[in-house]
């Protein structure tokens, strides 16, 4: 997150970290059910661990943390590497979470976002770009949903209805390492960090997010079929 600020503790209990061993964070994810996460399809790895209820980036033990294995990862069948359409994936955890103030699911919005909607994006991704500098704790950033026309103007021939753009003033953006993390609008999950320009936070080059309102049926049916 570029030019965000430290999230208040306990305010993002659905935020998950996807880790490669030993404790290398490579993507964010979102708890949407007691045993299921959503993340970006481009975050798929065969071997990874899931950390929930953790505030700092470092692997230091926190009393609220819960660790999991992913037993199943189900990318959206319409995703195409290295493209950006349908960039979402469900991960089934090896057990159900223990609900606490630090670990709790969020509902996926069935309403598509309208321009001007205020949202919050969070993650442990780099706080500088093109340099790489990772934060000590979870970062939060207020962003506004842009119209689809502004989005298409920013990225000609690259935007479809499975994506939406959001941003703020130049210099504020999600970035590498935030992928798969949540965009929360009006208390529900509206999007996932998907892609954007490099370096991040360039003028007139907003972040692009997976438009989850288009996938509520797929999410529900996939969870039901695999529970």
């Amino acid at each position: 997150i570029i030019n965000g600020s430290d999230c208040d503790m306990h305010t993002q209990p659905w935020q998950a970290a996807l880790l490669l061993r030993p404790n290398q964070l490579y993507c964010g994810a979102v708890l949407v059910h007691p045993q299921w996460l959503l993340t970006a399809a481009h975050c798929r790895k065969k071997v990874f661990r899931v950390r929930l209820g953790h505030y700092s980036l470092s692997p230091v033990y926190e009393s609220g943390q819960q660790m999991f294995q992913g037993v199943k990862s189900i990318p959206h069948p319409g995703y195409s590497h290295p493209g950006h359409s349908n960039d979402l994936m469900l991960i089934k955890l090896n057990r159900r979470i223990r609900p606490t103030k630090d670990v709790r699911p969020i509902n996926v919005s069935s309403h598509c976002p309208s321009a001007g909607t205020k949202c919050l994006v969070s993650g442990w991704g780099t706080t500088k770009s093109p340099q790489v500098h990772f934060p000590k704790v979870l970062q939060c950033l207020n962003i506004s949903v842009l119209s689809q026309k502004r989005c298409e103007d920013a990225y000609p021939r690259q935007i479809d209805d499975t994506m939406f753009c959001a941003g703020d003033k130049a210099g504020r953006d999600s970035c590498q390492g935030d992928s798969g993390g949540p965009v929360v609008c009006n208390g529900s999950l509206q999007g996932l960090v998907s892609w954007g320009d490099y370096p991040c936070a360039r003028p007139n080059r907003p972040g692009v997010y997976t438009n989850l309102c288009k996938f509520t049926k797929w999410i529900q049916e996939t969870i039901q079929a695999n529970s």
């Epitope: 294995q69 037993v71 199943k72 290295p82």
Partner: antibody, heavy 117, light 110 residues
């Protein structure tokens, strides 16, 4: 050097159990999923199953109930057991490492197991 | 079931030819497809993963494309060392799968 080496009896009697081990060197089993694949003489590759560092195991549907895959991370080896074997199980058996992006990037040299009385 | 069908099962070609092998999945596997080369008496060798990403040390004459159900392996200019059997493998799911590999395509000298 990253290496995989399969070993086990080259001959197994029908209705017996085929037991193979795969010795792993040059990388930690805690970081990678491992696969077993076999190839009957003159035929194509057949996936048998995968084992993950967490000891989660996926088996091919034909192998469920007959195959057991396990690992000993301290001894850095992966094992395969196939019970109730018939002549149709005669094959070269390979172990392989997944590169974490769903490609098998390191393979053992393979070991031929013949099922015959 | 996610069955993988390769075609052709064999082909004859000359050195310098452009060769195309196809792999079709019975359901969408997104981009989780790998290609392997196998020579007689040897273990398979990974060529391409994620449908189009070249594995380390693989010559650039090999390329992969496709997503969903239809995938292609192309050898832009066939070399003598490329005569071998090629296999595709899906990595989309392991649930209720008989085999993750396609049946293979043997590339022979014309």
């Amino acid at each position: 050097e990253v290496q995989l080496q399969e070993s086990g009896p080259g001959l197994v009697k029908p209705s017996g159990t085929l037991s193979l081990t795969c010795a792993v060197s040059g990388f930690p089993l805690s970081n990678y999923a491992m696969s077993w694949v076999r190839q009957p003489p003159g035929k194509g590759l057949e996936w048998i199953g995968d084992i993950y560092p967490s000891d989660i195991i996926d088996y091919a549907s034909w192998a469920k109930g007959r195959v057991t895959i396990s690992q000993d991370k301290s001894k850095t080896q992966v094992s395969l057991k196939l019970s109730s074997v018939t002549a149709a199980d005669t094959a070269v058996y390979y172990c392989a490492r997944d590169n974490n992006d769903y490609g098998l990037d390191i393979w053992g040299q393979g070991t031929l197991v013949t099922v015959s009385s | 079931a996610y069955d993988m069908t390769q075609s052709p099962s064999s082909l004859s070609a000359s050195v310098g030819d452009r060769v195309t092998i196809t792999c079709q999945a019975s359901q969408s596997i997104s981009s989780w497809l790998a290609w392997y080369q196998q020579k007689p008496g040897k273990a398979p060798k990974l060529l391409i993963y994620l449908a189009s990403t070249l594995a380390s040390g693989v010559p650039s004459r090999f390329s992969g494309s496709g997503s969903g159900t239809d995938f292609t392996l192309t050898i832009s200019s066939l070399q003598p060392e490329d005569f071998a059997t090629y296999y595709c493998q899906q990595g989309y799911t392991n649930s209720n799968i008989i085999n993750t590999f396609g049946g293979g395509t043997k590339v022979e000298i014309k």
